[in-house]
């Protein structure tokens, strides 16, 4: 015969958070440490697990095929029951009834996914949406690996993904003073650097790199590499490439200058020699296989070159250089110095010796030059 | 272990063709490019073709370009070299290679096939 | 294609000896040049991969080093299984281009 249970039988309600896919152990104790009668109920009263004799009995729920007790500990007077592979919809009050008293837990199952693909061109956006059961009013708090915090309800959105936005997030839901953490992996899909220059002296050998700011196991696509050279009035395309499985393969090159470009990652491309015809900036484009967009890196060549004509000495530099950067011409051991903020400096009649031609920014020397000048006789006049 | 093993080589007459195979045991083929390399009598080291794993790139040095063709079929472990319209200054022995994982270097060679050019 | 040059062609050397092979590259190849030993009637052997990688089983006295696009190898005391000829490899781009080789003899 049934007893009837009173409503002082009755425990205050937990709450309990759960995440979609993950197991939830709702714990139920008898106050005596032993094997006694339990059932597991839903709100609709039909029956999930209970104990009959010394087995454990599943009733027609849906979760009789995902709720299990952990056995081993029924003799100690514990009658949990686990849930896996947790579903939204699981999302109920679940009572639990053992020595006449019922304990009611609430248990809410959260679910939070990226409405897109978790690897994102950088610039792109992200939304994360929440999956929560009705009548629930969660809020939910994200952390970027970088420290950024944002905050939403049913979703969350960055505008645009910046490289330092790669990594693990950490998103807190809260629910009822009761939270539950979700780990999401996003890969901003970017160059290390959005920019770079190269100085070099006239001649010297030039090698432009191009590292990923990311590592997928196969990586396809293709790209290409404009150049605006700063004596040209347009643009030109230097390379195309593909990149099947991270082995690079050149399609097309120009014939001036003569590039060469590495097969392996990451990218990588050398000119034989600085010229001042090449100086200026280019663009490196990436197109990745199924995504749309393209992965950009602006490269700038600076080129120096100091020369002696008669009794002219110039030091001159092309390509992209900030008005802020110093150019000097300075006799080596010598205080003789002369300094502009321009692209060309020169000396008259200089004094024989090293001559040092230096490109500086705030002190620092981006590239220098030599250049010796040797003493110039007075030609004799003929009888 | 890795094991590389060619066949094919031999005697033939100026502009006749031949066809070399290079036989892999011991490893999943599609992953490694390989890559065929010669040495004339008493000379140095030459680089002659290379492949992708996947199999879709195919490289070729100035010297062989149009004449040789590179192929592999991964379902056999074997790497094929069609030798035609062949020179006096083919003869060699013929090595085929294989690259290490991510193309670090070429760290499994064969013993080499004898190709003979002459009339 | 990217030319290899290697000096010198010939070394005449004694046990316990060090000596140098150096390897100039045309064009920047990053690090992307091997060491091949080949001796007589065999196939080649690397040696070093990636202008310093010791590969496994080769003995210590074998290193390499880049200074822009010269590359060395040294073995700093010669023993008499190194008699042979040593090749470099730049395999940075397609196609790959082997130095000329250097005949290391027995003085």
């Known amino acids: 015969e049934q007893k009837l249970i009173s409503e002082e039988d009755l425990a205050a309600k937990k709450v309990v958070l759960g995440k979609k896919g993950d197991t939830v152990e709702l714990t139920c104790n008898a106050s005596q440490k032993k094997n006694t009668q339990f059932h597991w109920k839903n709100s609709n009263q039909i029956k999930i697990l209970g104990i009959q004799g010394l087995f454990l009995t599943k009733g027609p729920s849906k979760l009789s095929d995902r709720a299990d007790s952990r056995k081993s500990l029924w003799d100690q007077g514990c009658f949990s029951m686990i849930i896996k592979n947790l579903k939204i919809e699981d999302s109920d009050t679940y009572i639990c009834e053992v020595e006449n008293k019922k304990e009611e837990v609430e248990l809410l199952v959260f679910g939070l996914t990226a409405n897109s693909d978790t690897h994102l061109l950088e610039g792109q956006s992200l939304t994360l949406t929440l999956e929560s059961p009705p009548g629930s009013s969660p809020s939910v708090k994200c952390r970027s690996p970088g420290g950024k915090n944002i905050q939403g309800g049913r979703t969350i959105s960055v505008p645009q993904l910046e490289r330092q936005d790669s990594g693990t997030w950490t998103c807190t839901v809260s629910q009822d003073q009761k939270t539950v953490e979700f780990k999401i992996d996003i890969v901003v899909l970017a160059f290390q650097k959005a920019s770079s220059t190269v100085y070099k002296k006239e001649g010297e050998q030039v090698e432009f790199s191009f590292p990923l700011a990311f590592t997928l196991e196969k990586l396809t696509g293709s790209g290409e590499l404009w150049w605006q050279a700063e004596r040209a009035s347009s643009s030109k395309s230097w390379i195309t490439f593909d990149l099947k499985n991270k082995e690079v393969s050149v399609k097309r090159v120009t014939q001036d200058p003569k590039l060469q470009m590495g097969k392996k990652l990451p990218l990588h491309l050398t000119l034989p020699q600085a010229l001042p015809q090449y100086a200026g900036s280019g663009n490196l484009t990436l197109a990745l296989e199924a995504k749309t967009g393209k992965l950009h890196q602006e490269v700038n060549l600076v080129v120096m070159r100091a020369t002696q004509f008669q009794e002219n000495l110039t030091c001159e530099v092309w390509g992209p250089t900030s008005p802020k950067l110093t150019l000097s011409l300075k006799l080596e051991n010598k205080g003789a110095t002369v300094s502009k903020q321009a692209k060309a400096v020169w000396v008259l009649n200089p004094e024989a010796g090293m001559w040092q031609c230096l490109l500086s920014d705030s002190g620092q020397v981006l590239l220098e030059s030599n250049i010796k000048v040797v003493p110039t006789w007075p030609t004799p006049v003929q009888p | 272990e890795v094991e590389l093993l060619e066949s094919g080589g031999g005697l033939v007459q100026p502009g006749g063709s031949l066809r070399l195979s290079c036989a892999a045991s011991?490893?999943?083929?599609?992953?490694?490019?390989m890559s065929w390399v010669r040495q004339a009598p008493g000379k140095g080291l030459e680089w002659v073709s290379g492949?992708?794993?996947?199999?879709?790139?195919?490289y070729y040095a100035d010297s062989v370009k149009g004449r040789f063709t590179i192929t592999s079929d991964n379902s056999k472990n074997t790497l094929y070299l069609q030798m035609n319209s062949l020179r006096a200054e083919d003869t060699a022995v013929y090595y085929c290679?294989?690259?290490?994982?991510?193309?670090?270097?070429?760290?499994?060679w064969g013993k080499g096939t004898t190709v003979t050019v002459s009339s | 294609a990217i030319q290899m040059t290697q000096s010198p062609s010939s070394l005449s050397a004694s046990v316990g000896d060090r000596v140098t092979i150096t390897c100039r590259a045309s064009?920047?190849?990053?690090?992307?040049l091997g060491w091949y030993q080949q001796k007589p009637g065999k196939a080649p052997k690397v040696l070093i991969s990636?202008?310093?990688s010791l590969q496994s089983g080769v003995p210590s006295r074998f290193s390499g080093s880049r200074s822009g696009t010269d590359f060395t190898l040294t073995i700093s005391s010669l023993q008499p299984e190194d008699f042979a000829t040593y090749y470099c490899?730049?395999?940075?781009?397609?196609?790959?281009?082997f130095g000329q080789g250097t005949k290391l003899e027995i003085k």
């Open positions: 290679a294989k690259e290490g994982y991510n193309w670090n270097y070429m760290d499994v």
């Open positions: 011991g490893l999943t083929f599609s992953t490694f490019a």
């Open positions: 492949i992708s794993g996947s199999g879709e790139n195919t």
């Open positions: 064009h920047g190849i990053r690090n992307d």
């Open positions: 990636e202008t310093s």
């Open positions: 490899l730049q395999d940075y781009t397609y196609p790959y281009t």
